[in-house]
Amino acid sequence: CKAMHVAQPAVVLASSRGIASFVCEYASPGKATEVRVTVLRQADSQVTEVCAATYMMGNELTFLDDSICTGTSSGNQVNLTIQGLRAMDTGLYICKVELMYPPPYYLGIGNGTQIYVIDPEPCPDSDF
């Protein structure tokens, strides 16, 4: 079989509040009931895990309580939101999708979404 295809937008600009959202869509070769989604950040060949969630098809994604990610799923599409981003977090955010159950296991890795984060200018002091 070919690698499971995972599509995600090439570029996203974070909001002034440090929030970025993007869709991760995968072409499921089978009827998966349990899916694991991991967001990885790649910068200068270093890769770190940002967040991960396992969900049952038709149910909500549940990230850990202290996760900077939230998300929803609809069919073979996952809507991901990352918050608390700062300029130093600019990088390539890669969506990794694993079809965990039922067998066989499938793995697909997206080509990444370049998220640009611009820290807001501090408000000037007011004399009023």
């Epitope: 070919k2 890769v47 990444g112």
Partner: nanobody, 126 residues
Framework: EVQLVESGGGLVQPGGSLRLSCAAS????????IGWFRQDPGKEREMVSC????????KYADSVKGRFTISRDNSKNTVYLQMNSLRAEDTAVYYC???????????????????WGQGTRVTVSS
């Protein structure tokens, strides 16, 4: 379905050599990373060596540099790990892993692996 089948493990004396083989099947992409990892009971799986299918970029753990050599035979979809000057600390279960990556992905990064073989045991002891 992706299948990775390892062979070549066994018992060897310190200073000896072994050659591990990993035969990959069920995967038709011509771009991937494939490599060798090892794991001791109760420890994390660590990358030993890895090679990119296209271009042949390689990566080695510091602890095996100069002693282990990874190579591939694309016509047989097989990757080999030649292990020389084996030490007691090389004792572990060795797993073959595959990462279905593309050119944008960092070479041989453990986060991108997900397909695994069943493992072959290597024991270095006198």
């Amino acid at each position: 379905e992706v299948q990775l089948v390892e062979s070549g493990g066994g018992l060897v004396q310190p200073g000896g050599s072994l050659r591990l083989s990993c035969a990959a099947s069920g995967f038709s992409s011509d771009y991937y990373d494939i490599g060798w990892f090892r794991q001791d009971p109760g420890k994390e799986r660590e990358m030993v060596s890895c090679i990119r299918s296209s271009g042949g970029s390689t990566k080695y753990a510091d602890s095996v540099k100069g002693r282990f050599t990874i190579s591939r035979d694309n016509s047989k979809n097989t990757v080999y790990l030649q292990m020389n000057s084996l030490r007691a600390e090389d004792t572990a279960v060795y797993y073959c892993g595959l990462a279905p990556i593309s050119p944008v992905h960092a070479v041989c990064n453990q986060h991108y692996f997900g397909y695994w073989g069943q493992g072959t045991r290597v024991t270095v002891s006198s």
